[in-house]
């Protein structure tokens, strides 16, 4: 069987939801020594980056300027060390937002509920769309989808303090082209039977997995490794 290198990790820097006309940045994290990284869009080659020097960095960033609906879709990346190519990364869905109109989000019975009550979010957008999306701040990967002509409902089971947080919704014109976000609705859940101090609260910072963790191998790292090796010999 043909030998391949481990698949790289593809990430969106800051967020995979990019407002139209803004720049998207995708990171492809492979390995030190990779001489070439390729970004593929919907299965076709989209861009190529060659790190300099390749042995000192474990990935690259691909900048996609002027985001629009034609650039929104599924991205993946691969890398090469010498003549050997890696497996393809997982697919990353890149979404363009701020298309057309702004939906309105409301919540029943209201933004302040008691633990155990059932809650339903309503997202409404008068312009033609059929899919609606509900996202919780700090949990943007957990997208709930619902369908309707001008509005959609997002029922939630009996709520707990884990449901606390800020929610926004989008209308979707296709899987990768979303409307402007609604104004946020902050859901406050009170009166949990169990100890509420142990309930998870939402981070106010962006999703931790939407960060590029590319590292440079520095001279200092090499010096430390050499020092460690010398120290081991001395101890012997």
């Amino acid at each position: 069987p043909k030998q391949t290198l481990p698949k790289p990790i593809i990430r969106a820097e800051s967020t995979y939801m990019v407002p139209k006309e803004k720049q998207a940045t995708l990171c492809c994290q492979g390995s030190y020594g990779a001489v070439e990284y390729q970004l593929h869009f919907e299965g076709s080659l989209f861009a190529v980056e060659r790190p300099k020097p390749p042995e000192r960095i474990n990935g690259v960033k691909f900048h996609i300027p002027d985001m629009n609906s034609r650039k929104a879709g599924r991205y993946s990346c691969i890398y090469r060390v010498g003549e050997l190519w890696s497996e393809r990364s997982d697919l990353l869905d890149l979404v363009v937002t701020e298309m057309y109109d702004t939906p309105t989000l409301s919540v029943h019975p209201g933004p302040e509920v008691t633990s155990g009550e059932k809650v339903t979010f309503y997202c409404r957008l008068d312009t033609a769309t059929s899919m609606f999306l509900l996202l919780k701040e700090g949990r943007s990967r957990d997208v709930q989808r619902s369908y309707g002509k001008v509005q959609a409902e997002f029922p939630m089971g009996p709520v707990t303090t884990a449901h606390r947080g800020s929610y926004r919704c989008f209308g979707s014109y296709n899987n990768y082209a979303w409307s402007f976000p609604s104004e946020p609705v902050k859901l406050l859940v009170t009166g949990d039977i169990e100890n509420t101090s142990l309930a998870p609260t939402d981070p106010t910072f962006p999703d931790s997995w939407d960060t590029c963790l590319l590292t440079r191998e520095t001279g200092l790292q090499k010096d430390l490794a050499l020092w460690d090796h010398t120290a081991q010999n001395l101890l012997r």
Epitope: L105, S106, H108, P109, G110, G116, E117, Y122, P155, P158
Partner: antibody, heavy 115, light 107 residues
Amino acid sequence: QVQLQQPGAELVKPGASVKLSCKASGFTFTNYWMHWVKQRPGQGLEWIGMIHPNSGSTNYNEKFKSKATLTVDKSSSTAYMQLSSLTSEDSAVYYCAGGGRLDYWGQGTTLTVSS
Amino acid sequence: DIQMTQSPSSLSASLGERVSLTCRASQDIGSSLNWLQQEPDGTIKRLIYATSSLDSGVPKRFSGSRSGSDYSLTISSLESEDFVDYYCLQYASSPFTFGSGTKLEIK
């Protein structure tokens, strides 16, 4: 204090339409769901539907979808329910209620459909 | 639709007596249940929301509780103005549905 004002009575002919009103005061009208409920003489209560004045989102009881249309006028803090193609079956007291949990209730409008 | 089975349909009791009314939900409604009071002139007032939360201005003799799919309204010591009609209402799932009502009569 919170008040939901409804006209006491309406008399309309069969086949006609009527628009019932519910004027809200004492709370921020745009922030709260407005519900409509039907009660036939000597009978129980039936939920018709609700509307959110700020978003315009509505939710209807399937049974009343072709009968009732809910609207609001934010400038006057008034909720409306239009009932169409009226028959004697529509003769009832109609209540509006404010708040997601039907927190506050109007006094009700007695609708009589008669020729 | 969620059915709310309310019992009893009528209840005769004496002043000072403790009474309980029950509603059984046909599906899970969590704690999304109200108890309403309707006077003979048609005036409707909410007494309890979210199963057990007492509305402001409602006397402490009224209380709400839950056991599984059974929801109860208890009046600890009946007073003369309590002899009216009572309804439960689930607001968990559309269409919201009411119990058929309980007429509380003086013995």
